[in-house]
Amino acid sequence: SGVFQLQLQEFINERGVLASGRPCEPGCRTFFRVCLKHFQAVVSPGPCTFGTVSTPVLGTNSFAVRDDSSGGGRNPLQLPFNFTWPGTFSLIIEAWHAPGDDLRPEALPPDALISKIAIQGSLAVGQNWLLDEQTSTLTRLRYSYRVICSDNYYGDNCSRLCKKRNDHFGHYVCQPDGNLSCLPGWTGEYCQQPICLSGCHEQNGYCSKPAECLCRPGWQGRLCNECIPHNGCRHGTCSTPWQCTCDEGWGGLFCDQDLNYCTHHSPCKNGATCSNSGQRSYTCTCRPGYTGVDCELELSECDSNPCRNGGSCKDQEDGYHCLCPPGYYGLHCEHSTLSCADSPCFNGGSCRERNQGANYACECPPNFTGSNCEKKVDRCTSNPCANGGQCLNRGPSRMCRCRPGFTGTYCELHVSDCARNPCAHGGTCHDLENGLMCTCPAGFSGRRCEVRTSIDACASSPCFNRATCYTDLSTDTFVCNCPYGFVGSRCEFPVGLPPSFPW
């Protein structure tokens, strides 16, 4: 779509005559008729295919034509067209004499034509005016013309429609050739795609307006290049969303199970050596002179009653020393100078001679011990209570006072929080020092596996022989689509080798 513009500039008819040679009375009141049509090698009669236009009376005999375009007037003359400009044309301009105000052809005198010009040629779309002058025997017409595109039309033949816009359907202005030129911050064929914040991750980020970076689910950070770990992940990281890859020394679904208690808590005291022995579990190997679960108790070397035969023990800086009773000698008073004749056995112990009477041994009644049955049995010396339980002597027996979370004769049993089966949907219960933890089966989550979540039943690759696996989201089950030559719910059987059924 465009406009052929014709600017009439000057018409000369010095003698004021008509084409017939007859003079106008009193002068030639001149108006113009213009016919624009498709190119014809010889301008022929027929429709003005590109349009026609007439002017009012513009002057008498010879006159210059005023440019009226600024005042919304008729010069230049406008011949609009609504097709692709072909680049060629034929133009006919007729000058007519109008004695009165009625310019209709049938109202004019029979010989009212003053002059007629017909030109044809090529004309490219453009802003520049082509100046032309046509002379006949008695008249001369000076004019210029051009073809320009209508608003929103562009290109060599005004065939490209382009309307600048800045809305949901595009953000662009139009170049002279009709191509789109995107506004800053926009891209794409129709400039509908915003240019995101520089560095915004191509896959994990997006934007709805320029210089924005919105993260897709599972990603975070200014540029959406940081994954979000699994909710509740304590001592872990991720490389893809919802992962929880445990830091060194941590385990469990949420990396909250301490596998390196020694490093994280340094429980062993007094220079003891700590060894990890499982989840939240450790063993302290005490340096000499210390005891207790965490080697927190200073040990007197006399506590182990090293002196025999009633010898009394004295602590020393570099160890201990046994003061032996009469008739005994040696580091631990282990050697006797006595015999059965000396009645060395106390508390009803019976004496047996050895080495032809050179030595003896006492057989002690219950609850007494020592080489001379001189000691009451301390049932706690073997430290029988497990898990840090405290041993108490109670007459002929002993008893363990257990630490919280342990039970049993020797505190060997954990008090189980798991006994009441708190984990739903087949979750596995783990006792912890301060409570319990449920490990949920696929498809469930929550502290007690009470929340049903959608799972990808295909994640475990259950289908054989390159079958395609599809997840049934309504039942969280899978369906295998077998390739040619295989059957079975998992495509595990080759065709022709049916499974052996028991019936």
Partner: antibody, heavy 119, light 111 residues
Framework: EVQLQQSGPELVKTGASVKISCKAS????????IHWVKQSHGKSLEWIGY????????NYNQKFKGKATFTVDTSSSTAFMQFNSLTSEDSAVYYC????????????WGQGTSVTVSS | DIVLTQSPASLAVSLGQRATISCRAS??????????MKWFQQKPGQPPKLLIY???NQGSGVPARFSGSGSGTDFSLNIHPMEEDDTAMYFC?????????FGGGTKLEIK
């Protein structure tokens, strides 16, 4: 009132020439074109060509090139068609009609001139 | 040359009824949205008279019962209601290309 007045009937010998006239009145002769059309007895119409009454530019049907010649006399507002080397095939009624650049078509016709070619 | 084929060659229509004459061109006679097709009426001993130009526009002084339609290669002239005075030969004519050509004509009579 627009009128196209053609010359009278012609009886001519084979090989001779004939010149038919068409005098226009009631309109600005030079602004228009004059067409010439042949109609053989009981047959359809055949376009011979046209002439611009303003500058004498012509356009002929290839079939009649060399056979027909168009001229105009603007001073008398008359168009002429000369037919050469006549044969019996040229016996027909010949019409003139006016036409204009701002297409209506051949809106006014002459009454026709009958040409009979005899041996 | 563009060949124009008219049908039927002759037609008899009752007074007050509709007469339809067709004209088919051997190639399109349209250019820049205008159909270069005209219709003429010719009565015996008279010159042709312009009825329709540019396929559907009525010539000066032509009664409204004459109407034209079509584009490209297929055109028709309709006369409704048919009157006594409409007995004549009817010709289509194209002016898109030189040489201008006419159809063979259709003879319309009263039934």
């Amino acid at each position: 009132e627009v009128q196209l007045q053609q010359s009278g009937p012609e009886l001519v010998k084979t090989g001779a020439s004939v010149k038919i006239s068409c005098k226009a009145s009631g309109y600005s002769f030079t602004a228009y074109y004059i067409h010439w059309v042949k109609q053989s007895h009981g047959k359809s119409l055949e376009w011979i060509g046209y002439i611009s009454c303003y500058n004498g530019a012509t356009n002929y049907n290839q079939k009649f090139k060399g056979k027909a010649t168009f001229t105009v006399d603007t001073s008398s507002s008359t168009a002429f068609m000369q037919f050469n080397s006549l044969t019996s095939e040229d016996s027909a009624v010949y019409y003139c009609a006016r036409d204009y650049d701002y297409d209506v078509g051949m809106d006014y016709w002459g009454q026709g001139t009958s040409v009979t070619v005899s041996s | 040359d563009i060949v124009l084929t008219q049908s039927p060659a002759s037609l008899a229509v009752s007074l007050g009824q509709r007469a339809t004459i067709s004209c088919r061109a051997s190639e399109s006679v349209d250019n820049y949205g205008i159909s270069f097709m005209k219709w003429f009426q010719q009565k015996p001993g008279q010159p042709p008279k312009l009825l329709i130009y540019a396929a559907s526009n009525q010539g000066s002084g032509v009664p409204a019962r004459f109407s034209g339609s079509g584009s490209g290669t297929d055109f028709s002239l309709n006369i409704h209601p048919m009157e006594e005075d409409d007995t004549a030969m009817y010709f289509c004519q194209q002016s898109k290309e030189v040489p201008w050509t006419f159809g063979g004509g259709t003879k319309l009579e009263i039934k």
